[in-house]
């Protein structure tokens, strides 16, 4: 007849796909079983190995990330329960939808993490790594996206996503994106026979430079670049009484926005 065991937990560790547990038998040798289970797995025997005269261990691989596993060291009907949770994994893919980006919003998307996740934390940082916004989104198989609003036009942002399962968090994965710069406002034109003086007001947000283009039937005939502080630009050597397409392009954070206008030089 086997003796009842007296045992104490020595060590327990968990990673995303594996757990390790060690325990020590106190007193005389005895018989025990180590059983593990999860809410979806059912109960199974954990294959044990002997570390020394009194210490035993069990390592399990290929487990589901973010999952709670119950370990029961049982001897007759005496038992010690150890609850271990594997670390959740972040989404495999995480990005910004460029086609949904506006001057004041960024739309991010991700693929669901493998394993169990209760929620995702999505955080937005500026270029200086200052946190601007953060949100916690409950896990959903159908809704893996979020839009940040009220942002500054023409700015670069870093976005981090972290998967949360129970009391554990995954490591974060990052992506970056930029808001579209604001177009210029109030384009003013001063016309002469051979020249055009263009003036404008700054839009909101950040600008790195302004690019001005004068087109004739889709062909660039004159162009220029000015710094972000400029509010005017002059085109010279133009044809009198001629109709041009003027584009004032705002550039910032690798993106562009523009306003255009049809302008005619003064006749001779």
């Amino acid at each position: 007849e086997p003796e009842r065991c007296n045992f104490t937990l020595a060590e327990s560790k968990a990673s995303s796909h594996s757990v390790s547990i060690q325990w020590r038998i106190l007193g005389s040798p005895c018989n025990f079983s180590l059983i593990y289970s999860s809410d979806t797995l059912g109960a199974a025997l954990c294959p044990t190995f002997r570390i020394d005269n009194t210490t035993y261990g069990c390592n399990l691989q290929d487990l589901q990330a973010g999952t709670i596993y119950n370990f029961r060291i049982i001897s007759l009907d005496e038992e010690r329960t150890v609850v271990l949770q594997t670390d959740p994994l972040p989404p495999a893919r995480f990005g910004v939808s460029k086609e949904k980006t506006t001057s004041t919003s960024l739309h991010v998307w991700w693929t669901p993490s493998s394993g169990k996740v209760t929620s995702y934390e999505v955080q937005l940082f500026d270029e200086n790594n200052q946190k601007i916004q953060g949100v916690q989104i409950q896990e959903s198989t159908s809704w893996n996206e979020y839009t940040f609003f009220n942002l500054t036009a023409g700015s670069k942002y870093n976005i981090a996503i972290t998967a949360v399962s129970g009391g554990k968090r995954s490591f974060s994965v990052y992506t970056n994106g930029s808001t579209v710069p604001s177009p210029v406002k109030d384009i003013g034109i001063s016309t002469k026979a051979n020249s055009l003086l263009i003036s404008w007001s700054h839009g909101s947000g950040n600008v790195e430079r302004y690019r001005l283009m004068l087109m004739d039937k889709g062909i660039l005939v004159h162009g220029g670049v000015v710094d972000k502080h400029a509010t005017s630009y002059a085109f010279h050597g133009l044809t009198p009484g001629y109709l041009y397409n003027l584009t004032v392009m705002t550039e910032a954070a690798g993106l562009q926005n523009y306003r255009w206008k049809l302008v005619r030089t003064a006749p001779m």
Partner: antibody
């Protein structure tokens, strides 16, 4: 040698009560969980319930078909297991087995008594 | 409750031939499955526990396999004394439940 001897079976009318006993020997009774399993004549096995040890607060678990009618108890000082059966129905007619199970040495092992017959009939 | 469904309900196999009995759980039970043999007028006898571990004294022609929801008891070479009813049982979660039994006969 492990021995489990059931007693207390017999004929009882529907709606009546009966108390089965199981005398255990050959093992450390107070360290083991104990079960009752029944088998209707010519039918399969049906787990009735389980009682755990004092260190597990004598926790009990029951099959849905007997919940609220049957009560499992134990007296560790007498190495005895009991099954109190109330509001008996004809479908409770069966041989009732006392079963010890234990976890040890990476095992899950059961020992069975010879059973006692309970007949519920008017 | 977890339902254990055995197949077939009855099986006739020639002496020396292989007999296979299946047991399907209605939800995951890991490997917490036992197999029993019961002969007329006797209590069940434990053959296999943890799905694949033979109990002490059980001949090695008996073997168990499976995990999750699908389990199999195999008798590699049927002997006359193997004629009996065989039951699977899950002990993964309460209430513990048995399969309905498979009657094994000699063809």
């Amino acid at each position: 040698e492990v021995q489990l001897v059931e007693s207390g079976g017999g004929l009882v009318q529907p709606g009546g009560s009966l108390r089965l006993s199981c005398a255990a020997s050959g093992f450390t009774f107070n360290a083991n969980a104990m079960n009752w399993v029944r088998q209707a004549p010519g039918k399969g096995l049906e787990w009735v319930g389980r009682i755990r040890t004092k260190s597990n607060n004598y926790a009990t678990y029951y099959a849905g078909s007997v919940k609220d009618r049957f009560t499992i108890s134990r007296d560790d000082s007498k190495n005895s297991l009991y099954l109190q059966m109330n509001s008996l129905k004809t479908e409770d007619t069966a041989v009732y087995y006392c079963v010890r199970d234990y976890y040890g040495s990476s095992a899950w092992i059961t020992y069975w008594g010879q059973g006692t017959l309970v007949t519920v009939s008017s | 409750d977890i339902v254990m469904t055995q197949s077939p309900d009855s099986l006739a196999v020639s002496l020396g031939e292989r007999a296979t009995i299946n047991c399907k759980a209605s939800q995951h039970v890991g490997t917490a499955v036992a197999w029993y043999q019961q002969k007329p007028g006797q209590p069940p006898k434990l053959l296999i526990y943890w799905a694949s571990t033979r109990h002490t004294g059980v001949p090695d022609r008996f073997s168990g396999s499976g995990s999750g929801t699908d389990f199999t008891l195999t008798i590699s070479s049927l002997q006359a004394e193997d004629v009996a009813v065989y039951y699977c049982q899950q002990y993964s979660s309460y209430p513990f439940t048995f399969g309905q039994g498979t009657k094994l006969e000699i063809k």
